[in-house]
């Protein structure tokens, strides 16, 4: 209209998608009567009547807004429900009396995008690529207006950099009118980027102000050539025979090269390839001293066919040889002396110990054991232990049996055994001497003999308890080239008066056993009575 003042800027109303926009007609009473107003939407310069107010009563016009408009605030405000991105336009109210005036409102619509979805290049990136390679993609769905994307590496924003960093973004409009932003980060990476953390950030606006959403952080598989290969041995520290040893090749490249492990042949000095498992690990199990030697690893890059060799590594599998004792089978007369000497080889300094086999008592620390004024009790086992003190568990032993010439020596001279008539009795008799004696019984029964050690024998007799047997008792006789000796077993019937209140009254076999190295006891499963020690 000629002479009319320039139109003032429209009032700004900001709302989120899905909420209700309150469009307040800002005409003053002097500019128009709010009981008679027309509302228009303006889209691409075209006005469309959407709502009429007459005598304070509102009426929607047919069309896209028909179901979403209502009057509020005594007719001064038009409420638009379920706002969509398509509602971002100018709305105006026009008063009819006293003269036509209008008031414009700019509706701005916002919607936060969904969490940004980051996807890293699943195939990885070589450091020697000719141009920036695709590192990761970022998708921000259903935002309005279009959010802005910022890419970060190790917490620092990435800027476009010619031939180094390129960010390519595009957006698509969904049928809802919302935007989906897609962005791809292209970069030339270096070896140090193998641990770099990348993420993308979406910046967007809401009526409440500026906001942002961050994706999760990702690392990118970075491929770089191998510069160095080396060997690693497990376990670390001193190795010993019998250990499980793993020798593996390592490289500082990604992907690692094809590995092979070689050992130098000590006689030819040639490197001979060893057989590794599927993981390229050489497993020595059990490790032997022959595994000691010089190992090296070769890494072959199958792309460039460049081969790299590791520093050689000396592997030492520590060992202790078989232990030799001299004399190997000593025989001595009572009262004489004996010197036992122990020898062994090792890759380390050895420590020797002599122990009595039967008791485990340490007799000597050193390779030589001297025994003087030998008694028959000195007969039996002596063990030499050769060990490496610096390597726990690395030791070898040898047992030697010392024989003292002498007639049979009984574990007990006489013994009382409690029995029941008509029971099968299990009796045992033990003797020692050199040469080893044999045992005979004075009664008929089933006898079996067992060699306990080179000087000791145990005979077991199964016999039925009869009145005659109770009368005579049982004798066992041990004999060798140097003499004989006898033990007597007295049999006594169990009756009620011989049982004590705490005694065990279960029935079963009666046994009588004794040993020269233990207290001689007569045992019966029905009654246990200690006996005084008796030796022949």
């Amino acid at each position: 209209v000629p002479g009319e003042a320039e139109q003032p800027a429209p009032e700004l109303v900001e709302v989120e998608v899905g909420s209700t926009a309150l469009l307040k007609c800002g005409l003053s009473q002097s500019q128009g009567n709010l009981s008679h107003v027309d509302w228009f939407s303006v889209h691409k310069e075209k006005r469309t009547l959407i709502f009429r107010v007459r005598q304070g009563q509102g009426q929607s016009e047919p069309g896209e807004y028909e179901q979403r408009l209502s009057l509020q605030d005594r007719g001064a405000t038009l409420a638009l429900t379920q706002v969509t991105p398509q509602d971002e336009r100018i709305f105006l109210c026009q008063g009819k009396r006293p003269r036509s005036q209008e008031y414009r409102i700019q509706l701005r619509v916002y919607k936060a995008p969904e969490e940004p979805n980051i996807q890293v290049n699943p195939l990885g990136i070589p450091v020697n690529s000719k141009e920036p390679e695709e590192v990761a993609t970022c998708v921000g769905r259903n935002g309005y207006p279009i959010p802005q994307v910022i890419w970060y590496k190790n917490g620092r924003p990435l800027k476009e950099e010619k031939n180094r960093v390129h960010i390519q973004s595009s957006q698509t409009v969904e049928s809802s009118g919302l935007y989906t932003l897609q962005s791809i980060l292209k970069a030339q990476l270096v070896k140090e980027d193998k641990d770099a953390q990348f993420y993308c950030e979406l910046n967007y606006r809401l009526p409440s102000g500026n906001h942002m959403k961050e994706s999760r952080e990702v690392t990118v598989p970075v491929f770089y050539p191998t510069e160095k290969v080396w060997l690693e041995v497990e376990p670390v520290g001193m190795l010993k025979e019998g250990d499980r040893v793993e020798i593996r090749c390592l490289a500082d490249g990604n992907p690692p090269p094809h590995f092979s492990i070689s050992k130098q042949n000590p006689s030819t000095r040639e490197a001979e390839e060893e057989t590794t498992n599927d993981n390229g690990v050489l497993v020595l199990e059990p490790a032997r001293k022959e595994h000691s030697g010089r190992y090296e690893c070769q890494g072959l890059d199958l792309d460039t066919m460049i081969s790299l060799l590791s520093e050689p590594q000396e592997l030492l599998v520590n060992y202790v040889s078989d232990v030799r004792v001299s004399p190997a089978a000593p025989e001595r007369q009572e009262g004489s002396s004996l010197t036992l000497t122990c020898e062994a080889e090792s890759s380390q300094d050895l420590e020797f110990q002599w122990l009595r086999e039967e008791t485990g008592q340490v007799l000597e620390r050193g390779p030589v054991l001297q025994l003087h004024d030998l008694k028959r009790e000195a007969g039996g086992g002596y063990r030499c232990v050769a060990s490496v003190p610096s390597i726990p568990g690395l030791n070898r032993t040898q047992l030697v049996n010392v024989a003292i010439f002498g007639p049979p020596w009984m574990a007990f001279k006489e013994r009382k055994v409690w029995v029941k008539e008509n029971m099968v009795l299990n009796l045992s008799c033990e003797a020692s001497g050199h040469p080893r004696p044999t045992i005979s019984w004075n009664v008929n029964g089933t006898a079996s003999e067992q060699d306990q050690d080179p000087q000791r024998v145990l005979s077991t007799l199964n016999v039925l308890v009869t009145p005659e047997l109770l009368e005579t008792g049982v004798e066992c006789t041990a004999s060798n080239d140097l003499g004989k000796n006898t033990s007597i077993l007295f049999l006594e019937l169990v009756n009620l008066t011989t049982l004590t209140p705490d005694s065990n009254t279960t029935t079963g076999l009666s046994t009588s056993t004794a040993s020269p190295h233990t207290r001689a006891n007569s045992t019966s499963t029905e009654r246990k009575l200690p006996e005084p020690e008796s030796r022949g």
């Epitope: 979805n117 699943p122 195939l123 690529s129 920036p132 390679e133 695709e134 998708v139």
Partner: antibody, heavy 118, light 106 residues
Framework: QVQLKESGPGLVQPSQTLSLTCTVS????????VSWVRQPPGKGLEWIAA???????YYNSAFKSRLSISRNTSKSQVLLKMNSLQTEDTAMYFC????????????WGPGTMVTVSS | DIQVTQSPSLLSASVGDRVTLNCKAS??????LAWYQQKLGEGPKVLIF???SLQTGIPSRFSGSGSGTDFTLTISSLQPEDFATYFC????????FGAGTKLELK
């Protein structure tokens, strides 16, 4: 519209080399990466190799030593060479376009059947 | 390598049925998963990417869900043209495909 078409010899002798060509239209090889994927008769899909929009090549480590992928951007072709073929390499060979803003395959060719037999 | 396991391998259903296909990854792949449909004598066709995003032009009866190691493709109301083989594919580390689920008419 986006199209990919595989071509190859059909029949290959064991121990020979296979050469396959993927001819594309509707997009540029400098904008989208292309992969080769194969499918033995009645079996699942197996990714073989890829060439990125920047020209970087990638291979399935199971075949790496006998594969070569390359491209001719002016002819809009991606080439795959596979040597030392065995009967178990008999399969339908597909080329597929990688979506520009993702890592999945948004367009595939119809495939070409390769039979390894003497 | 990441393994991808699909179940069931064979699924019989009728037109109008709601069906669910499963895919399990051997390790966490976040949402780096796509679903493909393959009909006899054709190349695969992408249905779903990023685990739950519907590819342009694919009917809305197809939907994807899941994250981490367990994923699902749902067809809300089977149509005659949906009988085919369905593959899932992980693209978190390298590319590996499931063995497929064949969806057949009951």
């Amino acid at each position: 519209q986006v199209q990919l078409k595989e071509s190859g010899p059909g029949l290959v002798q064991p121990s020979q080399t296979l050469s396959l060509t993927c001819t594309v239209s509707g997009f540029s090889l400098t904008s989208n990466g292309v992969s080769w994927v194969r499918q033995p008769p009645g079996k699942g899909l197996e990714w073989i190799a890829a060439i990125s929009s920047g020209g970087t090549t990638y291979y399935n480590s199971a075949f790496k030593s006998r594969l070569s992928i390359s491209r001719n951007t002016s002819k809009s072709q991606v080439l795959l060479k596979m040597n030392s073929l065995q009967t178990e390499d008999t399969a339908m060979y597909f080329c597929a376009r990688r979506y520009g803003y993702g890592w999945y395959f948004d367009f595939w060719g119809p495939g070409t059947m390769v039979t390894v037999s003497s | 390598d990441i393994q991808v396991t699909q179940s069931p391998s064979l699924l019989s259903a009728s037109v109008g049925d709601r069906v669910t296909l499963n895919c399990k990854a051997s390790q966490n792949i976040y949402n780096s998963l796509a679903w493909y449909q393959q009909k006899l004598g054709e190349g695969p066709k992408v249905l779903i990417f990023n685990a739950n995003s519907l590819q342009t032009g694919i009917p809305s009866r197809f939907s994807g869900s899941g994250s981490g190691t367990d994923f699902t493709l749902t067809i809300s109301s089977l149509q005659p043209e949906d009988f085919a083989t369905y593959f899932c594919q992980q693209f978190y580390s390298g590319y590996t495909f499931g063995a497929g689920t064949k969806l057949e008419l009951k």
